[in-house]
Interface confidence: low
Amino acid sequence: DAHKSEVAHRFKDLGEENFKALVLIAFAQYLQQCPFEDHVKLVNEVTEFAKTCVADESAENCDKSLHTLFGDKLCTVATLRETYGEMADCCAKQEPERNECFLQHKDDNPNLPRLVRPEVDVMCTAFHDNEETFLKKYLYEIARRHPYFYAPELLFFAKRYKAAFTECCQAADKAACLLPKLDELRDEGKASSAKQRLKCASLQKFGERAFKAWAVARLSQRFPKAEFAEVSKLVTDLTKVHTECCHGDLLECADDRADLAKYICENQDSISSKLKECCEKPLLEKSHCIAEVENDEMPADLPSLAADFVESKDVCKNYAEAKDVFLGMFLYEYARRHPDYSVVLLLRLAKTYETTLEKCCAAADPHECYAKVFDEFKPLVEEPQNLIKQNCELFEQLGEYKFQNALLVRYTKKVPQVSTPTLVEVSRNLGKVGSKCCKHPEAKRMPCAEDYLSVVLNQLCVLHEKTPVSDRVTKCCTESLVNRRPCFSALEVDETYVPKEFNAETFTFHADICTLSEKERQIKKQTALVELVKHKPKATKEQLKAVMDDFAAFVEKCCKADDKETCFAEEGKKLVAASQAALGL
């Protein structure tokens, strides 16, 4: 039966706890500035309404779509216009335009205070006093800062967050137990958010076909023993799940993700031998585990690809009959044979193959025309291989911090118009590719590095889209999803850039730098480095290194001084003068 009441259907499928959590996430991702208490009130109202529909699906308004119900509820917020400005205009629209309007107003960089972690005892007291509110607050704070966070996965993070407090608040040394767990959740959460943001950007900016191509390649690498039809089914279902989550349809998304996990586990014999452990876990852990599962072993004796895709007389016939199916089969066959390639490289190869067939199948002698198509792949494969080799050598030479600095200089020179905080954040993340991927053997380096870089460059793209300042960034971000990294790699110094006026205030530091964590101190120094490059884009590496070394010595000296503030004032002036001289400012 088609459900009379969608809200009752989802409430019954998901259960009250998950229903409430997902509605809270959905509301916080839409209205990112609203206070916690307001959201809790709205969620409770929706939950009470859902219960009346469970009791009687024919009750008033129970037949309305979830978008209508949730949108109507969001539009009851009294301060909508003064808090959100033009977003309030969404409420004048009808569904589905109203939901699209809310989606367009999601802010990847909301103006929210940084989350400061309270003392461990304070957190444990809050956890014990009201566990439910404490966990809801976690969902709320993450969701509003990460409006595209994958909602069912956030439920998994919340479960781990709860487990950490349950265990550690009873431990002898609470801090030693809890803080590493919270650090791990924070870092994993940021990574998870960024990965999901790329999936949503792929769907929203480049369309379903682009996402499906990505999914075919990734799932074929992960499940190389699965038949093409099986991979296609998984891709279709996965696309639906991510379309829903990226579209704000979090209840449907979570429900469908659970169904997909169930299907995968029921059919693991025809999918992968690596799923057994995952499938023994409870739902949230199971779904997470499946999403992270290692690649299965490749089947032995896979025939050469050339037979079906180059040598066969039927290549153009098969291509013409069902272009996307044939290209999907090519991508599947290539990807299952190449777990050592990045997904984006596999997609570049498929695109090259498609372009060749488009051209050659219209030629007088198609076979003669496409016979050498695999030769065209060689430079495409070698480019990321060489780039990774060079950058891993540089990383091993410099270590993470200095490698990040090298990237900061490189990217600031490429796109100096981009805001300093964005350049620092993106370059720091780009630099983490070293410690994340360079430790891997050759066969795992490229998928690790290039697919991670795709995620980080997408952060740059979504932040830049909010306030576009560079045509070069816009071009690399919008022309081709799979060629973003090569596009940025190919950018040279921007010769059209007019250097920034020198402002001594930018390079004035105070004693508060001494109490910062090592990470925060690095960010301060890296911010100064970006500003230096913006003032002097033609500065050499040696000049910049000398200034940065002087700067590090200055901070170390003044942090050891008795009168720190005076030291920073006096020595700071000398440092600025010396730096100006060194750089010819």
Epitope: A2, H3, E6, E208, K233, T236, T239, K240, T243, E244, E252, E321, A322, K323, D324, V325
Partner: nanobody, 123 residues
Framework: QVQLQESGGGLVQPGGSLRLSCAAS????????IGWFRQAPGKEREGVSC????????NYADSVKGRFTISRDNAKNTVYLQMNKLKPEDTAVYYC????????????????WGQGTQVTVSS
Amino acid sequence: QVQLQESGGGLVQPGGSLRLSCAASGFTLDYYAIGWFRQAPGKEREGVSCIASSGGSTNYADSVKGRFTISRDNAKNTVYLQMNKLKPEDTAVYYCAAAVLECRTVVRGYDYWGQGTQVTVSS
């Protein structure tokens, strides 16, 4: 249980009309493109018409253009095929099928299929 159920078939005279319905149960049609296909005895299954999930994009086989109209009512979880000016060569079993978001170029691109409803055009 995911199901598509066709209805509205029957016997009709040439030049007559029928309205086929395709009702979904176990899932919501909002995210699905729905295609209508037909299979005459001894022939391959062929595409007749399709409507994308948004409802904004529709397509028709040349043989039915101007005579058949596809539409959807997501609130009722149902897609319709209005068939006017029917001809004897329209006689076949009519199937509806669902695929995520957009219409497919091939029969095997569809995820869910109905059992079919018989349409007979004869005087």
